[in-house]
Structure formats: structure tokens, C-alpha cells
């Protein structure tokens, strides 16, 4: 399945929106920094695009869920958040179209399931961190930066997959 060219443009717009959403500097939050253990290897070891797409879909779905909460709405600029949702929604649609095209393979490889689980656990760690930090401005800033980092890494993987074909 070939993702439309607009998909990578959307990814760049998503990163731009995440950058614009910044309210305070990470420098003000040194003591709140945290290693969430982004499962980078789950993106690096997917050799075929067919295996990668469900993992990327899970990643974007989890980002959408994270920023769709009541606490998130209180933390960020509403206009930017709406634009952010729109971009994520479009990317989910693009990826879903690819997942549907690949439905011919009825058995989901175990490796793919493990990768999806690793992504879910990563977001559970983020959610727990926010809860423990009582959704403070610094906690949200640390999370925003972390999502930028992990989203950027997964986007780079997408690009490398496209260039290999």
C-alpha cells in the first residue's frame, strides 16, 4: 500500500503544531524530565511496510487519545489542539486504508502484536507520569516534547521505508 504524498506533509504539519503548542520552556522543567522508554526497536525491526503500518497506526491512535482528554484540553491552546486533532485524524485515515488493503493476511504476525503492545505500554507510562505529576504545566511540557521526539522517530522510519521501495 502506498501512503499518499499528503501523509508525509501531514506528519510534518503535526510536528509543527506540536512545536507551536509549547507554552513554557523545557529549561524551566529540568527536574521534571523523565525517560519514558520509547520502544524505538519496535519501529526499527519492522522490515516490511505491511508490518510497520499497524504499529504506526497504534502510535498515532495513542497520541490522539492522550491529547483528547479533559486534562489535555485544559493544558493547550484550543485552536492549535483542534488543528492537531485534524492532522492526526487524517493520518489515521491514511493508515487505516492501508491496513484494510492488507487484510488478505488473516493471521496477524506475533511480532506485530508484540510491537503494538510495546507502544501501548509506552503510552501507559506517559499517562501514569502525568497522573503522578498532577497534570502540571511542566509535566505536560515534558510529555509534549517526548511525543515530538517519538513521533519524529516514527516518521523518519516511514520515510526510510518509502525510500527503500
Amino acid at each position: 500500500c502506498d501512503l499518499p504524498q499528503t501523509h508525509s506533509l501531514g506528519s510534518r504539519r503535526t510536528l509543527m503544531l506540536l512545536a507551536q503548542m509549547r507554552r513554557i520552556s523545557l529549561f524551566s522543567c529540568l527536574k521534571d524530565r523523565h525517560d519514558f522508554g520509547f520502544p524505538q526497536e519496535e519501529f526499527g525491526n519492522q522490515f516490511q511496510k505491511a508490518e510497520t503500518i499497524p504499529v504506526l497506526h497504534e502510535m498515532i491512535q495513542q497520541i490522539f487519545n492522550l491529547f483528547s482528554t479533559k486534562d489535555s484540553s485544559a493544558a493547550w491552546d484550543e485552536t492549535l489542539l483542534d488543528k492537531f486533532y485534524t492532522e492526526l485524524y487524517q493520518q489515521l485515515n491514511d493508515l487505516e486504508a492501508c491496513v484494510i488493503q492488507g487484510v488478505g493476511v488473516t493471521e496477524t504476525p506475533l511480532m506485530k502484536e508484540d510491537s503494538i503492545l510495546a507502544v501501548r505500554k509506552y503510552f501507559q507510562r506517559i499517562t501514569l507520569y502525568l497522573k503522578e505529576k498532577k497534570y502540571s504545566p511542566c509535566a505536560w511540557e515534558v510529555v509534549r516534547a517526548e511525543i515530538m521526539r517519538s513521533f519524529s522517530l516514527s516518521t523518519n522510519l516511514q520515510e526510510s521505508l518509502r525510500s527503500k521501495e
Partner: antibody, heavy 120, light 107 residues
Framework: QVQLVQSGAEVKKPGASVEVSCKAS????????INWVRQAPGQGLEWMGW????????TYAQKFQGRVTMTRDTSTSTVYMELSSLRSEDTAVYYC?????????????WGQGTLVTVSS | DIQMTQSPSSLSASVGDRVTITCRAS??????LAWYQQKSGKAPKLLIY???SLQSGVPSRFSGSGSGTDFTLTISSLQPEDFATYYC?????????FGPGTKVDIK
């Protein structure tokens, strides 16, 4: 690609002040904190402080507190570092430096440096 | 302030040599450490961040390790362009501090 371009060399007398500018081009100015790092001739690197171009928030190293002021002009995408009550030990190359959006404390982008000479 | 020390302060090596530089912090800094390379008259260049992550575009012969107070920068096979001064920097707390540097020159 973001670039940091600094103002030219300065020669100042002891007791005077100097202002060094750092202009960001090719990127979103407000996205990255700008740090100032200096290096005396033949010496190591010394962090002076940082400024958030978006809010204007600053943190200065205790050593420079009261003598350094960092400001920004969002209309020209420029940050400024002013050091007052100059003494000979302030003779150094002054660099502005910036990190990425998610690890701004690691400086992957540097200006070319501005030599400030303090001499009577 | 957190003090950073480096050893050796200088070393002479040949092309192809394996070079190891150590950096020690006066208190635990977890993995909040970077390594920079600086050539004469130039601005420093980021090589390694978060103690062991290789900065984009930096050759894989450079590697970093360590956490807490003791860190190492290794150049697996020294190349002519690697002769320079190397600095470590802690990013754990303000003020950020650098090590005094290690100068690597030709034997």
C-alpha cells in the same frame, strides 16, 4: 535549516559594557531556547545562561548574575547578550547555541562566535 | 555547581588507534551528559547526547557510555579529521558545566 549568525568582533575598555547579537534564520525563532557559552583564549567552555525567545524567560549562571542581561527581539528573530562592568578576564569568544525541540540542553546548533577583547 | 573532570587532559595517538576519554561528575547526573568536538577557531560540534546517543550525521566510530558519575567517549578507529579537543557537558542541573577538555593530537 536553522542558522545562528552572530555580530562582529568587539574591543572594549575595562568597566564598559558589550552587547552581542545572535540572529536565527531559516526556522521558527520561538521554538528553541538560546544559550550563551563563552571560551577564553586557550581555555574551556563556560555556560553563561539561556533565554526562551518565546516568553523572554531567562536563567543566568550565578557567576554572571547582576552583570549579564539576555533579551530578545521577536520582530527580527534576534537575541542579545549584554555583559557589563567588563574586566580583562572577560576577553573570550562568545557563542550563542541552541538545542533541539525535545532536548534543548544538548547544543547541536552554534553561532560562529564573537570575539570580545577587553583591554585598556 | 557540578564539577566535571576529564582525563587525560591530552593524548597523542595515531590514525587507526582506539581512543578512550573519560569524564567524571562531582555528583550523579544520571545520563544527562553530552560530548562535543572542537577544532581550532571553530564552534564546538555535538557528537553524543544522553550519554550514549549518537547525534545525527556523526560517524559511528564515536560512541559514548556510562551513567551516574562516570562516562566514557570512545573513538574506535581514529581518523585524521578526529584530531581535536573533546569536551563533556552535564545537562543535569543549572548551571550547565563543561569538562576542561581533552586534546587529541598526532603521535
Amino acid at each position: 535549516q536553522v542558522q545562528l549568525v552572530q555580530s562582529g568582533a568587539e574591543v572594549k575598555k575595562p568597566g564598559a559594557s558589550v552587547e552581542v547579537s545572535c540572529k536565527a534564520s531559516g526556522g521558527t525563532f520561538s521554538s528553541y531556547a538560546i544559550n550563551w557559552v563563552r571560551q577564553a583564549p586557550g581555555q574551556g567552555l563556560e555556560w553563561m545562561g539561556w533565554i526562551d525567545p518565546k516568553s523572554g524567560d531567562t536563567t543566568y549562571a550565578q557567576k554572571f548574575q547582576g552583570r549579564v542581561t539576555m533579551t530578545r527581539d521577536t520582530s527580527t528573530s534576534t537575541v542579545y547578550m549584554e555583559l557589563s562592568s567588563l574586566r580583562s578576564e572577560d576577553t573570550a569568544v562568545y557563542y550563542c547555541a541552541s538545542g533541539g525541540s525535545y532536548s534543548p540542553w544538548y547544543f547541536d546548533l552554534w553561532g560562529q562566535g564573537t570575539l570580545v577583547t577587553v583591554s585598556s | 555547581d557540578i564539577q566535571m573532570t576529564q582525563s587525560p587532559s591530552s593524548l597523542s595517538a595515531s590514525v587507526g588507534d582506539r581512543v578512550t576519554i573519560t569524564c567524571r561528575a562531582s555528583q550523579s547526573i544520571s545520563s544527562w551528559l553530552a560530548w562535543y568536538q572542537q577544532k581550532s577557531g571553530k564552534a564546538p560540534k555535538l557528537l553524543i547526547y544522553a550519554a550514549s546517543s549518537l547525534q545525527s550525521g556523526v560517524p559511528s566510530r564515536f560512541s559514548g557510555s556510562g551513567s551516574g558519575t562516570d562516562f566514557t567517549l570512545t573513538i574506535s578507529s581514529l581518523q585524521p579529521e578526529d584530531f581535536a579537543t573533546y569536551y563533556c557537558q552535564q545537562a543535569y542541573s543549572f548551571p550547565f558545566t563543561f569538562g576542561p577538555g581533552t586534546k587529541v593530537d598526532i603521535k
